[in-house]
Every structure is written in structure tokens, then in C-alpha cells.
């Protein structure tokens, strides 16, 4: 019997996720695969040999290899999930625990600038705990959470790239910025 600590798993709000059971191969010896959501100690999906597969609601799908799919993740899907696998003799051959954490995907960062004082702003509007990174002509300049403001002096023309990322997504924007010599908008 193998009981391991939780596998940390990240999912994106509104997306589907597959909870794959590592180092598990389905075989004829397997009689029972049971998935539980531990916060309410409720069985949410179960495969039994020669019986109809059980699923507590349609957002769950249980594959033949034991993988649990959760469709259209919602915030209350964030939980600890446990899968217990039994053989035909009723022996518990495997247990795995998944710590499912959910974040909202980041939106595409928005780059705006003013030539009057050569100031550029990169901002990400949506997403849980985003990290922003700003680049000028390929050189990494700054990192921040939701907004980066940068005053540039080296050249009036430059290519700026801004990336926003979190644990479930990454988006980037690129803007070639060109300002006239006199610094007019």
C-alpha cells in the first residue's frame, strides 16, 4: 500500500483539468477506483468492475485509466481530492492525494505610453496573483504585480514587451514605441 503526500495541482477557473494518477497502470486485477472530495468526505466518482461507473455530477468524468476530469472549474472545486484503488481481493493497492488549487487566468497585458514624458505603462486587468515582466528591445527591465510604469531615456524608438503570468497561464503583448524628437504625443 502506498500513501503519499499531496500532489500540488493547479487549475484555471472555467477550464477543465485532468487529475492523472502517477505511476498507475490499469490492469485486470483492479476492481475499484474511488475518488473523494475530502472537505465534505463525499464520494464523487467511482469505477467498479462489471458495474456502471458512478459520478456525483456531470462535471466529473472518470476515464478507464483512473484519471478524473473536472469540467469547467469553479472556485469551490478547490479542494483536496483522494483516489483509492482496490484490487479484486479488496486490497487497497494505491492511494494518492491531490491538492487542487485554482486561479483565474491572466488577461493580455495592456501597454500604453506617452511621448511627452517618455513614460510607458504595462497593466494586467484580470488574473489571480499575476507577475508582470517588462522588456525593452529584449532586455529585462522590471517586474511587478499588476502595473509597471517605466520612464525610458535611452532611445525614442524601442520595442517593448510585457508578459503577465501566474500558475495557470501566461500572456504577452508587444508594442513598437516610436516618439518624435520633440516628444509630442
Amino acid at each position: 500500500k502506498e500513501i503519499t503526500n499531496a500532489l500540488e495541482t493547479w487549475g484555471a477557473l472555467g477550464q477543465d483539468i485532468n487529475l492523472d494518477i502517477p505511476s498507475f497502470q490499469m490492469s485486470d486485477d483492479i476492481d475499484d477506483i474511488k475518488w473523494e472530495k475530502t472537505s465534505d468526505k463525499k464520494k464523487i466518482a467511482q469505477f467498479r468492475k462489471e458495474k456502471e461507473t458512478f459520478k456525483e455530477k456531470d462535471t466529473y468524468k472518470l476515464f478507464k485509466n483512473g484519471t478524473l476530469k473536472i469540467k469547467h472549474l469553479k472556485t469551490d472545486d478547490q479542494d483536496i481530492y483522494k483516489v483509492s484503488i482496490y484490487d479484486t481481493k479488496g486490497k487497497n493497492v494505491l492511494e494518492k492525494i491531490f491538492d487542487l488549487k485554482i486561479q483565474e487566468r491572466v488577461s493580455k497585458p495592456k501597454i500604453s505610453w506617452t511621448c511627452i514624458n517618455t513614460t510607458l505603462t504595462c497593466e494586467v486587468m484580470n488574473g489571480t496573483d499575476p507577475e508582470l515582466n517588462l522588456y525593452q528591445d529584449g532586455k529585462h527591465l522590471k517586474l511587478s504585480q499588476r502595473v509597471i510604469t517605466h520612464k525610458w531615456t535611452t532611445s525614442l524608438s524601442a520595442k517593448f514587451k510585457c508578459t503577465a503570468g501566474n500558475k495557470v497561464s501566461k500572456e504577452s503583448s508587444v508594442e513598437p514605441v516610436s516618439c518624435p524628437e520633440k516628444g509630442l504625443d
Epitope: 495541482t9 515582466n133 517586474l143 508578459t163 495557470v168
Partner: antibody, heavy 118, light 106 residues
């Protein structure tokens, strides 16, 4: 549980290269930047750079930009750091550590001790 | 780059004593983390995002600060706290560590 596995030691000749590995398990590999940190004997910690396994975006400390190359192999969930043109100054323990801006470096490997000697 | 200056470099305390170590940044930072390292072992995340205790860290530890001044405090030092503590900023590239404060017990 989250684990970062690194080989214990590497012995390399001056001028040669070494490729250090860091195998991740117990978490979604593409969700965290992987950092590399250098520590010389009886010295402090020095950040070398980091890589985002999601798309291989890298950030380096300027002094390591020419000697360190960070890569990842998503299929084996392994991060690599290749160090080239090694000198005795590069003899150190090299750690991999996953991390994000808000979490800091929350899990560290055991470190690989690199000895540069002829 | 942002330079982090930790003080004192070495400090000695008796069990039960309250100790505070500081980390000053050459420019304002918004995300400061602290790591504990004992001889011959990997660093461990100790306090993150200025004031949050990492899993397993005793409640006698606390972190505070903002801008350019941050601190780690132990309300009542115990023998197991003897270690080197490093601060680290995640607000500017390159990420930088302080030189460390070595805490010794009398």
C-alpha cells in the same frame, strides 16, 4: 510531496563545462519559475537566474549571462543549468529552487557541489 | 541592482531573549522573503511576502516592514533557531539576497 532532486557532486577541469540537473516532482512543473542559486564555501547566496518551464523565458544576473545557460525538459520535468569556461571561482554548491514573486523560493534542491580542479 | 544590507552580520542571544535582525534595501521593494540556513543544508523558506510564516515555522517568528526597511523578529529565542538568516527581494531584476545574519546562541 514537492521534491527537487539534484546530483550530489561534480568534479570538472578548469576551462571545461558542466550541465547540472534538477528533477522536479509532486507539483505542476510549468506553474513555477525555476531559480538557480550559487553558494561558495562559507559565503552567502547569489542568484544566477531563473527559467519559466511554461515557455522557457529566462532572466539572468548579468555576470552569469555568458557562462550559464538555463533550459528545461518538460517531458521529464527536469531543469538544467549548463556552466561553461569554469574556473576555481566557480567551485560552489549550486541549488535549484522553485519560486514566484509572492511565494519566494519555497522548495529547494539539496544542491550540487561543483569542484573545479585540475 | 537592489543591494540588501543585513545587520548585524553576527548576533548572539540567550534562550528566551527577543531578537530582531534587519534588512535594508538600496531602493524600495514590495516583496521581501527570508530564508533560514543551517550549516551543510539547503536554505529553507522561512518568512515570505514580508510577514507570512512558511509551513512548519514556529509562531515565535514574525516579519514586518515596507519600502526599504524590513525585519525578522524572534520573540523568544530557542536553541534550534541558531542559523544564518538571509533576506531576498523579488521586486527587481536581478533578484538579490542579503549577506545574511548569523544567529548564535549563548
Amino acid at each position: 510531496q514537492v521534491q527537487l532532486q539534484q546530483p550530489g557532486a561534480e568534479l570538472v577541469r578548469p576551462g571545461a563545462s558542466v550541465k547540472l540537473s534538477c528533477k522536479a516532482s509532486g507539483y505542476t512543473f510549468t506553474s513555477y519559475w525555476m531559480n538557480w542559486v550559487k553558494q561558495r564555501p562559507e559565503q552567502g547566496l547569489e542568484w544566477i537566474g531563473r527559467i519559466d518551464p511554461h515557455d522557457s523565458e529566462t532572466h539572468y544576473r548579468q555576470k552569469f549571462k555568458d557562462m550559464a545557460i538555463l533550459t528545461v525538459d518538460k517531458s521529464s520535468r527536469t531543469a538544467y543549468m549548463q556552466l561553461s569556461s569554469l574556473t576555481s571561482e566557480d567551485s560552489a554548491v549550486y541549488y535549484c529552487a522553485r519560486g514566484t514573486m509572492l511565494d519566494g523560493m519555497d522548495y529547494w534542491g539539496q544542491g550540487t557541489s561543483v569542484t573545479v580542479s585540475s | 541592482q537592489i543591494v540588501l544590507t543585513q545587520s548585524p552580520a553576527i548576533m548572539s542571544a540567550s534562550p528566551g531573549e527577543k531578537v530582531t535582525m534587519t534588512c535594508r534595501a538600496s531602493s524600495s521593494v514590495s516583496h521581501m522573503h527570508w530564508y533560514q540556513q543551517k550549516s551543510g543544508t539547503s536554505p529553507k523558506r522561512w518568512i515570505y511576502d514580508t510577514s507570512k510564516l512558511a509551513s512548519g515555522v514556529p509562531a515565535r517568528f514574525s516579519g514586518s516592514g515596507s519600502g526599504t526597511s524590513y525585519s525578522l523578529t524572534i520573540s523568544s529565542v530557542e536553541a534550534e533557531d541558531a542559523a544564518t538568516y538571509y533576506c531576498q527581494q523579488w521586486s527587481s531584476n536581478p533578484l538579490t539576497f542579503g549577506a545574511g545574519t548569523k544567529l548564535e546562541l549563548k
